[in-house]
Interface confidence: low
């Protein structure tokens, strides 16, 4: 399926609006510090060029690859060296090395100011004055802060963003209409970004075999009535889509995602009974809906797995003939029977099964050796079950804020070398698992909790890779994707850590505390808590609780005072002294 001009092919397939949106996202994800106007100019130039290629595919440069065209365009940015330093060296390279170089310089934690939400009237005026620029600005701001955001999904978010403003800027109470919608989009967007970041890490750090195994397990849970060959086809196509998006090939990715949605909707009967309502929707919504579709009902008459995978005398023969096929079918069969297991658990079981076959198929009596293989799964299954049970009990007992604090203490003791902002961000997100998953019925708790934790821990891994400070974190992040969460769970207090020297400045607070939102206050307190643990890693829960209770009382007292700043200046040192004494 070769085309004389790739850029013309993608422009025609995607249409001008999506083409321009995707090119803007691609450029913003690569050059995260460039001003909006510069990106818009580059996108317009690329779009005009694409139109000339649509008119005449044999026109000059139209036969060049998209990487060549886009890379050449990015390398025209005049301030590349000043703004990006060594990233400018990428421009001296030839494709495909140049694109790889740009990818390596994507920054997961760019030094960009947090997005401030203007007044509703200000936003509505901007929306009405120039809708197109307003929506481009949204794509740009999200893409530069989330350089691995799933591009076709970001177009769907932008469509919802537009719909929210179109509806709410007409409403009697604009703020009451708009703000909850924007909060929802923000939270969903952050979750979507983190989920996609795990997919890209899986592909980039562990290869497409790891991603395919994940996809086989997840799609088999979603589509338990589909045949293995059908699941395999979907896995192949999905792997291609995500490989492209993670590799910066956003036009190809969006085009292939649309093809996959089309294929799924044309073959619903052999995939799932749950696809129908998705397939009636327009493209962006349809693709989103298909990605989020609920699990189909399991076929009623599924036989026991033991017959083919334990009791059969042909297990080693079948395994030796095509190891990946046999293991893939095992994973498919196990996953379609277990929507109640996390994907990561299913992958651990497949790994354990593979290890048993490797050992037993070389033994004198293979059948005797692997006869008890399913019994070996029991501890692997019970470990996440117990973890979810214990943590949900703790969450229900403490509530979200205090549950986050318990996790902050736990993780700071495990890996105290990690920066305080990273520990606060990651532990706060780990703590959100409670509200997200603990209210669900038993059968949905583990897949919700463990697969969510995998996403959050990947964020820790990605941030740590940028600035490595802990061998333990490196080990848990790089040794095995499926065992990351158990690896972190198993970490104990780091005995080798030298406690951080006490710094009174860290525990000095001012009257600006009183004007912070509830969330910002929590972050301030949790930052102090992490610093306390870094200073006294062996402090008991009771000691830490006492200090944090005193802290809350001190802040509350000073925020009620007439002269707030004077209160903080007077009471602050007393709080610090009392805390040091309590922790001595």
């Amino acid at each position: 399926d070769t085309h004389k001009s790739e850029v013309a092919h993608r422009f025609k397939d995607l249409g001008e609006e999506h083409f321009k949106g995707l090119v803007l996202v691609a450029f913003s994800q690569y050059l995260q510090q460039c001003p909006f106007e510069e990106h818009v100019k580059l996108v317009n130039e690329v779009t005009e060029f694409a139109k000339t290629c649509v008119a005449d595919e044999s026109a000059e440069n139209c036969d060049k690859s998209l990487h060549t065209l886009f890379g050449d365009k990015l390398c025209t940015v005049a301030t590349l060296r000043e703004t990006y330093g060594e990233m400018a060296d990428c421009c001296a390279k030839q494709e495909p090395e140049r694109n790889e170089c740009f990818l390596q310089h994507k920054d997961d934690n760019p030094n960009l100011p947090p997005l401030v939400r203007p007044e509703v009237d200000v936003m509505c005026t901007a929306f009405h004055d120039n809708e197109a620029t307003f929506l481009k600005k949204y794509l740009y701001e999200v893409a530069r802060r989330h350089p691995y955001f799933y591009a076709p999904e970001l177009l769907f978010f932008a469509a919802r963003y537009k719909a929210a403003f179109a509806e709410c800027c007409q409403a009697a109470d604009k703020a009451a209409c708009l703000l909850p919608k924007l909060d929802e989009l923000r939270d969903e967007g952050k979750a979507s970004s983190a989920k996609q970041r795990l997919k890209c890490a899986s592909l980039q750090k562990f290869g497409d075999r790891a991603f395919k195994a994940w996809a086989v397990a997840r799609l088999s849970q979603k589509f338990p009535k589909a045949e293995f060959a059908e699941v395999s086809k979907l896995v192949t196509d999905l792997t291609k889509v995500h490989t492209e998006c993670c590799h910066g090939d956003l036009l190809e990715c969006a085009d292939d995602r649309a093809d996959l949605a089309k294929y799924m909707c044309e073959n619903q009967d052999s995939i799932s009974s749950k696809l129908k309502e998705c397939c009636d929707k327009p493209l962006l919504e349809k693709s989103h809906c298909l990605a989020e579709v609920e699990n189909d009902e399991m076929p009623a008459d599924l036989p026991s797995l033991a017959a083919d995978y334990v009791e059969s005398k042909d297990v080693c023969k079948n395994y030796a003939e095509a190891k990946d096929v046999f293991l893939g079918m095992f994973l498919y069969e196990y996953a379609r029977r277990h929507p109640d297991y996390s994907v990561m658990l299913l992958l651990r079981l497949a790994k354990a099964y593979e290890a048993t076959l490797e050992k037993c198929c070389a033994a004198a009596d293979p059948h005797e050796c692997y006869a008890k293989v399913f019994d070996e799964f029991q501890p692997l299954v019970e470990e996440p079950q117990n973890l979810v049970k214990q943590n949900c009990e703790l969450f229900e007992q403490l509530g979200e804020y205090k549950f986050q604090n318990a996790l902050l203490v736990r993780y700071t003791k495990k890996v105290p070398q990690v920066s305080t902002p990273t520990l606060v961000e990651v532990s706060r997100n780990l703590g959100k698992v409670g509200a997200k998953c603990c209210k669900l019925p038993e059968a949905k708790r583990m897949p919700c909790a463990e697969d969510y934790l995998s996403v959050v821990l990947n964020r820790l891994c990605v941030l740590h890779e940028k600035t490595p400070v802990s061998e333990k974190v490196t080990k848990c992040c790089t040794e095995s994707l499926v065992n990351r969460r158990p690896c972190f769970s198993a970490l104990e207090l780091d005995e080798a850590y030298v406690p951080k020297a006490f710094n009174a400045e860290t525990f000095t607070f001012h009257a600006d505390m009183c004007t912070l939102s509830e969330k910002e206050k929590q972050v301030k307190k949790q930052t102090a808590l992490v610093e306390l643990v870094k200073h006294k890693p062996k402090a008991t829960k009771e000691q830490l609780k006492g200090v944090m209770d005193n802290f809350a009382a001190f802040v509350e007292k000073c925020c009620k005072a007439d002269d707030k700043e004077a209160c903080f200046a007077e009471e602050g040192p007393k709080f610090v002294a009392a805390s040091q004494a309590a922790l001595a």
Epitope: K233, V235, T236, V325
Partner: nanobody
């Protein structure tokens, strides 16, 4: 379904060369990986070479440096160039293919290396 047809097998002297071909037909758009396996009498089937759609290859140590797998996507054909053949390379050679794993198999072609 995908159909695979191997050709190019035969009798060759030790130290000689052979080139096997395998042509795929049917639902080939889903094929990502193609491979060669072999099975000697009384032995288990053994992996020989694999190539992905993008062209990345891998081989076991027993054939590395002697065998080369290549692929012509336009002709839906995969080749196995076998040089410096040894008597222990005697086997039925099977072509295999699949979207994620090699799940479709050919009938096999006999390769005999005489000393």
């Amino acid at each position: 379904q995908v159909q695979l047809v191997e050709s190019g097998g035969g009798l060759v002297q030790a130290g000689g060369s052979l080139r096997l071909s395998c042509t795929a037909s049917g639902s080939i758009e889903s094929i990502n990986r193609m491979a060669w396996y072999r099975q000697a009498p009384g032995q288990q089937r053994e992996f020989v070479a694999r190539i992905s759609k993008g062209g990345s290859t891998n081989y076991p140590d027993s054939v590395k440096g002697r065998f080369t797998i290549s692929r012509d996507n336009a002709k839906n054909t995969v080749y196995l160039q076998m040089n410096s053949l040894k008597p222990e390379d005697t086997a039925v050679y099977y072509c295999a293919a699949g979207p994620v794993w090699e799940q479709f198999w050919g009938q096999g072609t006999q390769v005999t290396v005489s000393s």
